[in-house]
Interface confidence: low
């Protein structure tokens, strides 16, 4: 706020006041009075530029009047007090409201003072993110959505993430006039890596005293990535038994995991217990091709192991998942 | 008041690095992404990249990946931005800015690489 | 990477004129422009925000508007201190790009 003058009157209010569409505001204004100083106001006016006529007078013996006298009100202005607080309350605040107003007190001897205010109409937008489900497609797709609706100006959206990635954000009218609702994709080549992963979209808009942070929780769908590990290639003659463990990546979870060899169904030293497959102590060598397949909603993979089991006496550490 | 303080003028040779800096002042630093922009005659402004210092997480132009390194340091406020293997190309005034809901810019640092 | 296509590149005025300065968008960016001026030997100062919101302190003056892939800047009664270089900017798409500029000059 400007400082009040020397050894003059000065009308003292805000370059600026926010308001929110539909809340009510009060428009600040006062007229600094230096100490010693004789000042007699007559009228307090708020006009607004660009409009002719006044939308709001306090005359000293007349009162108020207003040109929308459901909307308006002097705050503190009062018949047979010094009119020195001009501050002016606008109910209802619509986007037109939006714009530079004239706050005017006419005294005596000094004549007229003025300043101008500028009321801004804010809407404060709500914020949503969400997961876009997807597969995997081999090109840039949106995988999360991030909106905000009914802001007044619009919100700014951004995206956070270290995976890469690109915003696309487009702009239509909010529901209630004047207002606009920010939609932002943010959008990447889907891969199972990304899937699980968080993304954050952060929404700034100067009705917030903090930007927004909203998490989405990314979701991709994909076959099944298998491998199998328990096998170190130091299996022998003799040894005890071991389990070697079809691991599998996928979305949906698995619905089946089926064991096989090259040469068709398992033989008798191999057991299938779901993802893992028991080997029983053998009593002569083996190489052999084993066979994990493994289902989901999206199709089937599968891997391949070689495992030989070798003669000579097993060392102190040979094998894995030795009992 | 908003003030972002950015280092003074560099004089470098070719071939070498340099860290520019950028303190920010009266407001919450982790709050906004701080970006960086590189100005010339010939390219006009364009735009480097960004860092989020509440996160970390930065976002480059294409253009200066591998060329500038973003980074932060919440305690005090202040972000940097590395320039590597540099030539007379990488001449030129760079600003830091919060860019979108603030106006505020720094004072710029002129790079001159001879 | 999004092309800003900003015209002219000079523009000789005298004070109380009329100017506009124009930025077509190579694909379409909604309304996330901002217009920035800068003064010889200064730092850009954001002007207009979101196409067409001023910031708190620009003159009234300023204005702009459009959406899409047209975009243009207006002073309305220009004065002496309005002389500078004015450039556009969209950031609807990383990487952001800017207009080359467009300087503002007394006849």
């Known amino acids: 706020w400007p400082p009040p003058g020397t050894g003059d009157v000065v009308v003292q209010a805000p370059t600026q006041v926010p308001g929110f569409l539909g809340d009510s505001v009060t428009l600040p204004c006062y007229l600094q009075v230096p100490n010693m100083e004789v000042t007699h106001v007559s009228q307090l006016t708020w006009a607004r530029h660009g409009e002719s006529g006044s939308m709001a007078v306090f005359h000293q013996t007349q009162g108020p009047s207003y040109s929308e006298s459901k909307r308006l009100e002097f705050v503190a202005a009062r018949l047979g007090a010094e009119l020195r607080n001009a501050s002016l309350r606008m109910f209802g605040l619509r986007v037109e409201d939006e714009g530079n107003y004239t706050c005017l007190f006419v005294t005596f001897p000094q004549g007229s003072r003025s300043v101008d205010i500028w009321l801004r109409v804010l809407a404060k937008p709500q914020n949503t993110a969400e997961v876009q489900k997807v597969q995997l497609t081999g090109e840039p797709v949106p995988m999360a959505r991030c909106v905000s609706t009914g802001g007044r100006p619009p919100a700014q959206i951004t995206w956070h993430s270290d995976l890469g990635g690109m915003p696309n954000t487009s702009q239509v009218p909010g529901f209630l006039s004047g207002t606009v609702t920010v939609t932002s994709l943010w959008i990447l080549v889907p891969s199972s890596q990304v899937d699980g992963k968080n993304v954050t979209c952060k929404v700034e808009h100067e009705s917030f005293e903090k930007p927004q942070l909203l998490t989405v929780n990314l979701t991709v769908y994909y076959p099944p990535e298998v491998s199998i590990s328990g096998y170190d290639n130091n299996w022998y003659l003799g040894q005890n038994e071991a389990t070697l463990t079809c691991d599998a990546r996928s979305n949906p979870e698995p619905t089946g995991y089926n064991w096989s060899t090259t040469m068709g169904p398992l033989p008798p030293f191999a057991v299938a217990q779901g993802a893992q497959l028991l080997i029983r102590p053998v009593d002569k060598p083996i190489n052999t091709t084993l066979i994990c397949n493994v289902t989901n909603a999206l199709g089937a993979r599968q891997a391949e192991l070689t495992v030989q089991v070798k003669e000579g006496p097993p060392s102190e550490h040979s094998g894995i998942s030795r009992n | 008041e908003v003030q972002l303080q950015q280092s003074g003028a560099e004089l470098v040779r070719p071939g070498t690095s340099v860290k520019l800096s950028c303190k920010a002042l009266g407001y919450t630093f982790t709050d906004h992404e701080m970006h960086w922009v590189k100005q010339t005659p010939v390219h006009g402004l364009e735009w480097i990249g960004t860092i989020h210092p509440g996160s970390g997480v930065t976002a480059y132009n294409q253009k200066f990946k591998g060329k500038a390194t973003l980074t932060a340091d919440k305690s005090s406020s202040t972000a940097y931005m590395e320039l590597s293997t540099l030539t007379s190309e990488d001449s030129a005034v760079y600003y830091c800015?919060?860019?979108?809901?603030?106006?505020?810019w720094g004072q710029g640092t002129t790079l001159t690489v001879s | 990477d999004i092309q800003m296509t900003q015209t002219p590149k000079f523009m000789s005025t005298s004070v109380g004129d009329r100017v506009s300065v124009t930025c077509k968008a190579s694909q379409n960016v909604a309304t996330n422009v901002v217009w920035f001026q800068q003064k010889s030997g200064q730092s850009p100062k954001a002007l207009i925000y979101?196409?067409?919101y001023r910031y708190s302190g620009v003159p009234d003056r300023f204005t702009g508007s459009g959406s899409g892939t047209d975009f243009t800047l207006t002073i309305s009664n220009v004065q002496s201190e309005d002389l500078a270089e004015y450039f556009c900017?969209?950031?609807?798409?990383?990487?952001?790009?800017f207009g080359a500029g467009t300087k503002l000059e007394l006849k």
């Open positions: 979101s196409a067409s």
């Open positions: 900017q969209q950031y609807n798409n990383y990487p952001l790009t």
């Open positions: 800015t919060p860019l979108w809901l603030r106006r505020d």
